[in-house]
């Protein structure tokens, strides 16, 4: 008969808090005759966590039938892994004996250390909207996992970033770790549509990274372009201007006419036209009322959008000889 | 279905010899430690000797020198040749298998009986 | 050699009772220890073994306990089908050695 050995063949197990750990034991003989059982640690202090032979552990069952002669292997699954389970397990032959069992052999023991899953990544974009060709910067963070080493990736609308920098902490041993990474990201002006994606790699995911997201519509500004134009038509004794809002985000925009620098008119943008790229644009109807008195008269459209530094047009608006008399006619 | 079937007991006389067989089925004999266990009529049981799965063999102290247990792993089976025969050997001899890791008796045979009488 | 002592070596009770035989070593045997249940005129059948462990088949009316020195068997609830000569034996070291017996009767 070859001499007993007894094989423990991965020297770490990666485990995560809930799940069943298996830890592998074969044996390469059947003699001496006597029981397997399984500790925790070495030495007069060290745990029984499986005994063949008697005891009950419920939260261990064997891997194969222990009751058949020709069984070789002696390996174990533990239920339910909270972070009190980690250590080095051994396997050990005993060989029977009174008044106890005398230990024969050892396997080499396997370190089952906890595998905890990184948190589901967030991520989080700037505090303040900023406008196109801007830099802003979004930090992911992802906490509580193990082991320390971890991948972690941008991307803009499927495109990789480069422009980044990730910490990992602590630098030590620990029994878990955080990792935040901060990406700078330039701005277009259609990125009101677009996404920053932070992906993290651990081994403990089995190849299905996580993924946090942000939308650039949270750090966006697209200031709005204006136009003032008059109307050609005119309504009895008024003429119709209009001052079109076009391509801003977000939809935030209050408007104001002034009439030679008198305000008459105050309006909340509402009923918006959406664009392709995710800005917005609107109109403002203006009546002005036209008489004999009013020769020079100057409209001004200002647009105050997102809290931001009023901007505005101005229109001279064009009265003709023409348009006074049909005026006239039209007063009675 | 498990099973040990013992045969070759009878009556000889003191000092005669006696070979018994035990024929197992449903499981390989030469993976498990076998043993031969004895009793006399109307009184309890007492082992006789025993061979291990690597060939080693043990007895109790009456019977040292007389008796030989082997077994023939290509008919599966176990024998207990008797030697010098006595008076004292005579009973109802069992062919029994060992527990899996301890050795602990699982699987008894009907028995076969030996009867040395002159 | 390892001597095994039963008590008692009889015992009469009636169906439904529970039951209890010892066993006692004269040394400590760990808990390498065997009890067998035999009829008249049949082989013995294995109950327990490692002091308290069932074998398969063997009903849950069946407990045994104890280590070292001292061992116990019981029997539940008795069924007419329980009365038999039951044996210990400690197969700790060779040679193996069984207990006189305990004849459970029907009183």
């Known amino acids: 008969e070859e001499e007993l050995q007894m094989i423990q063949p991965e020297k770490l197990l990666l485990v995560t808090v809930g799940k069943t750990a298996t830890l592998h034991c074969t044996v390469t003989s059947l003699l001496p005759v006597g029981p397997v059982l399984w500790f925790r640690g070495v030495g007069p202090g060290r745990e029984l966590i499986y005994n063949q032979k008697e005891g009950h552990f419920p939260r261990v069952t064997t891997v194969s039938d222990l009751t058949k002669r020709n069984n070789m292997d002696f390996s174990i699954r533990i239920s339910s892994i909270t972070p009190a389970d980690v250590g080095t397990y051994y396997c050990v032959k005993f060989r029977k004996g009174s008044p106890d069992d005398v230990e024969f052999k050892s396997g080499p023991g396997t370190e089952m250390a906890l595998g905890a899953k990184p948190s589901a990544p967030v991520v989080l974009g700037p505090a303040a909207r900023t406008t196109p060709e801007h830099t802003v910067s979004f930090t992911c963070e992802s906490h509580g996992f193990s082991p320390r080493d971890i991948t972690l990736k941008w991307f803009k609308n499927g495109n990789e970033l480069s422009d980044f920098q990730t910490n990992v902490d602590p630098t030590g041993q620990s029994v878990a770790y955080s990792i935040r990474s901060t990406a700078r990201v330039v701005l277009d002006p259609w990125d009101v549509r677009s996404q920053v994606i932070c992906e993290v790699a651990h081994v403990t995911l089995q190849g299905d990274p996580l993924r946090g997201t942000a939308n650039l519509s949270e750090a966006i500004r697209v200031p709005p372009t204006l136009e003032v134009t008059q109307q050609p038509m005119r309504v009895g004794n008024q003429v119709n201007v209009t001052c079109q809002v076009r391509k801003f985000y977000p939809q935030s925009l209050q408007l104001t006419w002034s009439e030679n620098g008198n305000v008459c008119q105050r309006e909340t943008a509402s009923t918006l036209t959406e664009n392709k790229d995710g800005t917005y644009n609107w109109t403002s109807w203006f009546l002005v009322n036209i008489s004999d008195q009013r020769d020079d008269v100057v409209l001004t459209c200002q647009v105050k959008h997102d809290g931001q530094l009023a901007v505005s047009k101005r229109l001279a608006l064009e009265v003709t000889v023409h348009q006074k008399d049909q005026s006239s006619d039209a007063t009675p | 279905e498990v099973q040990l079937v013992e045969s070759g007991g009878g009556l000889v006389q003191p000092g005669g010899s006696l070979r018994l067989s035990c024929a197992a089925s449903g499981f390989t004999l030469s993976s498990y430690d076998m043993h031969w266990v004895r009793q006399a009529t109307g009184k309890g049981l007492e082992w006789v000797s025993a061979?291990?799965?690597?060939?080693?063999?043990y007895y109790t102290g009456s019977v040292k020198g007389r008796f030989t247990i082997s077994r023939e792993n290509a008919k599966n089976s176990l024998y207990l040749q008797m030697n010098s025969l006595r008076a004292g050997d005579t009973a109802v001899y069992y062919c029994v298998r060992g527990g899996v890791w301890d050795d602990a008796f699982d699987i008894w045979g009907q028995g076969t009986m030996v009867t040395v009488s002159s | 050699d390892i001597q095994m002592t039963q008590s008692p070596s009889s015992l009469s009770a009636s169906v439904g009772d529970r039951v209890t035989i010892t066993c006692r070593a004269s040394?400590?045997?760990?808990?390498?220890l065997a009890w067998f249940q035999q009829k008249p005129g049949k082989a013995p059948k294995s109950l327990i073994y490692t002091a308290s462990s069932l074998h398969s088949g063997v009903p849950s009316k069946f407990s045994g306990s104890g280590s070292g020195t001292d061992f116990t068997l019981t029997i539940s609830s008795l069924q007419p089908e329980d009365f038999a000569t039951y044996y210990c034996q400690q197969y700790v070291s060779y040679p193996y050695t069984f207990g006189q017996g305990t004849k459970l009767e029907i009183k």
């Open positions: 040394q400590d045997i760990n808990n390498y």
């Open positions: 061979i291990g799965t690597a060939g080693d063999t």
